[in-house]
């Protein structure tokens, strides 16, 4: 039975040219996290963080994606095309797979405020 929940940074906004941290957190379960996959709105892979093998960064993003902090991702040099959904998929044992969603809006304006965190069951 899957008892865990994924908490994410929710809906966030950031300034064009700036950077943003995409972060998910798995709680309410003792399951072991074996891997976290980060994917974009079109289901293309941004990165993988395997507990033992470390990080895989999709080559198209190697100059703009920094691993971490933790199991999260830092997306740098933001463009307007980065606006959209991002998904964290937690592969766990023995629970199975948990998935969280973040919506990133990249703004032209100089002010970009982060919204409150929210939970996805």
């Amino acid at each position: 039975m899957m008892t865990g929940t994924i908490e994410t940074t929710g809906n966030i906004s950031a300034k064009k040219g700036g950077s943003v941290i995409l972060q998910c957190h798995l709680s309410s379960t003792m399951a072991q996290v074996t891997q976290v996959n980060w994917e974009q709105h079109d289901h293309s892979l941004l990165a993988i963080r395997n507990a033992e093998l470390g990080w895989h960064i999709y080559p198209a993003f190697k100059d703009r994606v920094a691993p971490g902090p933790g199991l999260g991702l830092t997306l740098q040099s933001l463009t307007m095309n980065d606006t959209g959904e991002y998904f964290c998929t937690y592969h766990t044992y023995p629970d199975g797979t948990y998935r969280g969603r973040i919506f990133l809006e990249v703004l032209e304006s100089s002010v970009a405020e982060h919204s409150a965190r929210f939970q996805i069951p």
């Epitope: 074996t34 891997q35 996959n37 994917e39 289901h43 293309s44 892979l45 993988i48 395997n50 507990a51 033992e52 093998l53 470390g54 990080w55 895989h56 960064i57 999709y58 080559p59 198209a60 190697k62 691993p67 592969h91």
Partner: antibody
Framework: EVQLVQSGAEVKKPGSSVKVSCKAS????????IHWVRQAPGQGLEWMGG????????IYNQIFRGRVTITADKSTSTAYMELSSLRSEDTAVYYC????????????WGQGTTVTVSS | DIQMTQSPSSLSASVGDRVTITCRAS??????VVWYQQKPGKAPKLLIY???YRFTGVPSRFSGSGSGTDFTLTISSLQPEDFATYYC?????????FGGGTKVEIK
């Protein structure tokens, strides 16, 4: 030049163990994961597991059910793969391979070690 | 475990031919696919990763494409040194798994 040099061919009895070595050179050993892949005669490739020398992390293909152990000696830049409780189906060529940095692709491979299990 | 199914398992072609090999994953693997080339008695060599980036030194006649579950390796103009067996592999989730291989033979 990146090189992975493996130990020589082995002939083993069923039920015994074999330990294959893989000596790395031409790069910083702790910066790249080492994987082990095997290939039975006339068959395809099968991933056995990997070892991350950066933090001594190991991951195994559960199909081997605890029969495989991957270790390394960082002082000599050498990785090891030990397979126990050998059976005839374990007759294969065993390869070590290095993973590219920040990429789950095996970019350099050892020459292979033939392990024959026969009574 | 994710199954990777390659087709065809073998093909005969002539020098200069355009050759296409396909690989289908049993479930979504995004762009986490790699292609290797192996010649008899030799270790595999990395050709293409992620799944359209050529590894260092790989000729431009080799190209890869696909996403999700369906992937393709194309050799635009087959050369004598290209006769070999080609394998796809997924690293979307462990255990990493390979396709059964496609043997490219001389017609």
């Amino acid at each position: 030049e990146v090189q992975l040099v493996q130990s020589g061919a082995e002939v083993k009895k069923p039920g015994s163990s074999v330990k294959v070595s893989c000596k790395a050179s031409g790069y910083t050993f702790t910066e790249h994961v080492i994987h082990w892949v095997r290939q039975a005669p006339g068959q395809g490739l099968e991933w056995m597991g990997g070892f991350n020398p950066n933090h001594d992390g190991t991951i195994y293909n559960q199909i081997f059910r605890g029969r495989v152990t991957i270790t390394a000696d960082k002082s000599t830049s050498t990785a090891y793969m030990e397979l126990s409780s050998l059976r005839s189906e374990d007759t294969a060529v065993y390869y070590c391979a290095r993973a590219a940095k920040l990429l789950f692709a095996m970019d350099y491979w050892g020459q292979g070690t033939t392990v024959t299990v026969s009574s | 475990d994710i199954q990777m199914t390659q087709s065809p398992s073998s093909l005969s072609a002539s020098v200069g031919d355009r050759v296409t090999i396909t690989c289908r994953a049993s479930q979504h693997v995004s762009n986490a696919v790699v292609w290797y080339q192996q010649k008899p008695g030799k270790a595999p060599k990395l050709l293409i990763y992620s799944p359209s980036y050529r590894f260092t030194g790989v000729p431009s006649r080799f190209s890869g494409s696909g996403s999700g579950t369906d992937f393709t390796l194309t050799i635009s103009s087959l050369q004598p040194e290209d006769f070999a067996t080609y394998y796809c592999q997924q690293h979307y989730s462990t255990p990493w798994t390979f396709g059964g291989g496609t043997k490219v033979e001389i017609k």
